[in-house]
Interface confidence: medium
């Protein structure tokens, strides 16, 4: 229903705390360079204004759209052009073009220092002094680094952060309590960020239809007892919610997400037997719990999928009369039977089925033509299964760091033109798939591996799009979203690449490496490894192993030396010479 004042309506629905958090996220995602203090001032102004509209919906400007109100606030910031350059040109446009313009200026890789977690004592002090400000900083710092982070989910992580600090700051050993718990929240949040970016990419590049197909497959896997009409309703709602969040309509998105959770909890009987535990929780936790819900049990008496989609003589009639509904039903039926497949794979199978019907229904004997379609799915299913098997075996053999290095070599050979920091980030993330998925039961491995890899490769594509350097990467990134992972997997050594000149300074290290945390040390070594591959793209595994082993020993030796600087200065050139020789 239409409301006189959209902002008053959202404020009343969401409550002041969530309203303020979402406005802060929205501003931080649009203007990523502004300091917290500047954003919090705007948030307070917007909140005060919303309160006046709650008191009187007819008050001046209360009838304006939220985009108009937010955009006007952003455009009133002094020195906008100095700080944001051409983003300031957006302010000359009218809504909805102005908001579209803001969205186009979101930076997936803003030039911001990595988010450093303060010392445990300092954290607890500042949290206890002002919890609201502390959590506001958290929202701001995450949102500006991840401009497409799913806003209601970020509120959930802030709540988790709050819980951890409340619990750990009373402990005697605060660091021992905080570190593992905050690491876990951070890990989950980072995965959530890449997954949501993938959803927004899907929406931006391929539109709502593609996203809805993804949602139908996902919902059908989770709720195999729900009927197609129910799945369609849920998929339509999820598509609307994600469209809103990806489009910067964060208040509407969070409000609609809460509504969907309410609907699901009121209709458990027709959706899933697993929802009850989630439905007893408060709103943010309820929505998050429902989003992560385990699959319901598959109905025992499902007939063969062939009956409706291959053996039925009306297949072509069904397809011709209402293509999307028919294909949607196919996707639903196939997905509810296969929680062990990735959504990407299910969408590839649906695409194959569609292509088969397009071809066969135009022929003289359609049933004879499409009769073998299910058998033709086999190679499409085998390919990701083999990918999981070989990669998990390699992970089990090498461990996470070694597996990351193997992936880094592989991807540097596939796309040596891509910047080293981007390759290292991608390989580290791709390499985490082992820890995340390979330890799961067999039936959960494939969906975990492939859907996670797809999200990480989407991040690679998003970064590459900003500064395209590799034709092969552009080709894989331009195609369909579900074909990306197989496309990248199929890439081989780029034969067109002219190897990089060997620069001694790239492999020159100083004693500062000794005091770096383990993660930073790994990144330094992996940076050197990528540079080695760029210098010698066809280096063998043994050659690279020799050089990297030598390098690790050199760092270890010099970090233990009494005069570290002298050791690095004298041993470094020897290492470079030996490395050149080993790779000759």
């Amino acid at each position: 229903e239409a409301h006189k004042s959209e902002i008053a309506h959202r404020f009343k629905d969401l409550g002041e705390q969530h309203f303020k958090g979402l406005v802060l996220i929205a501003f931080s995602q649009y203007l990523q360079k502004c300091p917290y203090e500047e954003h919090i001032k705007l948030v307070q102004e917007v909140t005060d204004f919303a309160k006046t509209c709650v008191a009187d919906e007819n008050a001046e400007n209360c009838d304006k759209s939220i985009h108009t109100l937010f955009g006007d606030k952003l455009c009133a910031i002094p020195k906008l052009r100095d700080n944001y350059g051409e983003l300031a040109d957006c302010c000359a446009k009218q809504e909805p073009e102005r908001n579209e313009c803001f969205l186009q200026h979101k930076d997936d890789n803003p030039n911001l220092p990595p988010f450093q977690r303060p010392e445990a004592e300092a954290m607890c002090t500042s949290f206890q002094e002002n919890p609201t400000s502390f959590l506001g900083h958290y929202l701001h710092e995450v949102a500006r680094r991840h401009p497409y982070f799913y806003a209601p989910e970020l509120l959930y992580y802030a709540e988790k952060y709050n819980e951890v600090l409340t619990q750990c700051c009373t402990e005697s050993d605060k660091a021992a309590c905080l570190t593992p718990k905050l690491d876990a929240v951070k890990e989950k949040a980072l995965v959530a960020a890449v997954r949501q970016r993938m959803k927004c990419s899907s929406m931006q590049r391929f539109g709502e239809r593609a996203f809805k197909a993804w949602a139908v497959a996902r919902m059908s896997q989770r709720f195999p007892n729900a009927e197609f009409a129910e799945i369609t309703k849920l998929a339509t709602d999820v598509t609307k919610i994600n469209k809103e969040c990806c489009h910067g309509d964060l208040l509407e998105c969070a409000d609609d997400r809460a509504e969907l959770a309410k609907y699901m909890c009121e209709n458990q009987a027709t959706i899933s037997s697993k929802l009850q535990a989630c439905c007893d929780k408060p709103v943010l936790q309820k929505s998050q719990c429902l989003a992560e819900i385990e699959h319901d049990n598959i109905p025992a008496d499902l007939p063969s999928i062939a009956a409706d989609f291959v053996e039925d003589k009306e297949v072509c009639k069904n397809y011709a009369e209402a293509k999307d509904v028919f294909l949607g039903t196919f996707l639903y039926e196939y997905s509810r039977r296969h929680p062990d497949y990735s959504v990407s794979l299910l969408l590839r199978l649906a695409k194959k089925y569609e292509a088969t019907l397009e071809k066969c229904c135009a022929e003289g004997d359609p049933p004879a033509c499409y009769g073998t379609v299910l058998a033709e799915f086999q190679p499409l299913v085998e390919e990701p299964k083999n990918l999981v098997k070989t990669n998990c075996e390699l992970y089990e053999k090498l461990g996470e760091y070694g597996f990351q290095n193997a992936v880094l070599v592989r991807y540097t050979q596939k796309a040596p033109q891509v910047s080293t920091p981007t390759l290292v980030e991608a390989a580290r993330n791709l390499g985490r798939v082992g820890t995340k998925c390979c330890t799961l039961p067999e039936a959960q491995r494939l969906p975990c591996v492939e859907d996670y890899l797809s999200a990480i490769l989407n991040r690679l594509c998003v970064l590459h799009e900003k500064t395209p350097v590799s034709e092969k990467v552009t080709k894989c990134c331009s195609g369909s979203l579900v074909e990306r992972r197989p496309c990248f997997s199929a890439l081989t050594v780029d034969e067109t690449y002219v190897p990089k000149e060997f620069k001694a300074e790239t492999f020159t290290f100083h004693s500062d490496i000794c005091t770096l945390p383990d993660k930073e040390k790994q990144i330094k070594k992996q940076t050197a490894l990528a540079e080695l591959v760029k210098h010698k793209p066809k280096a063998t595994e043994d050659q690279l192993k020799t050089v990297m082993g030598d390098f690790a020993q050199f760092v270890d030796k010099c970090c233990k030396a009494a005069d570290k600087d002298n050791c690095f200065a004298t041993e470094g050139p020897n290492l470079v010479a030996r490395s050149k020789e080993a790779l000759a």
């Epitope: 009927e227 197609f228 009409a229 129910e230 007939p303 009956a307 409706d308 053996e311 039925d312 003589k313 009306e314 009639k317 069904n318 009369e321 209402a322 509904v325 028919f326 949607g328 039903t329």
Partner: nanobody, 126 residues
Framework: EVQLLESGGGLVQPGGSLRLSCAAS????????VAWFRQAPGKEREFVAG????????YYADSVKGRFTISRDNSKNTLYLQMNSLRPEDTAVYYC???????????????????WGQGTLVTVSS
Amino acid sequence: EVQLLESGGGLVQPGGSLRLSCAASGRYIDETAVAWFRQAPGKEREFVAGIGGGVDITYYADSVKGRFTISRDNSKNTLYLQMNSLRPEDTAVYYCAARPGRPLITSKVADLYPYWGQGTLVTVSS
């Protein structure tokens, strides 16, 4: 759960007409793929006509095409089968069957329908 109740059967002369009704409860009939099947004494149950759920796409067995018409009245939650030009070979017990949540697909395979009425007898004889 879906409950189905057929009515409208009876004795009719060859060339005559009958209209069968199937009242549904427990589910909106427009969301459900529904069909009429029939079973003559000593024969297999066979598909007669069907209509998709959510999309009014109709299906007929070759033997009844042009003579029978399937329709539904969503406001009354009822399915109909208008039978014209009846022949002695149309004599059978007519059953109404439903496949909830099935847009379009009205399969002709009886086993795929989980819900059935108790049937109404149609006799075509002079």
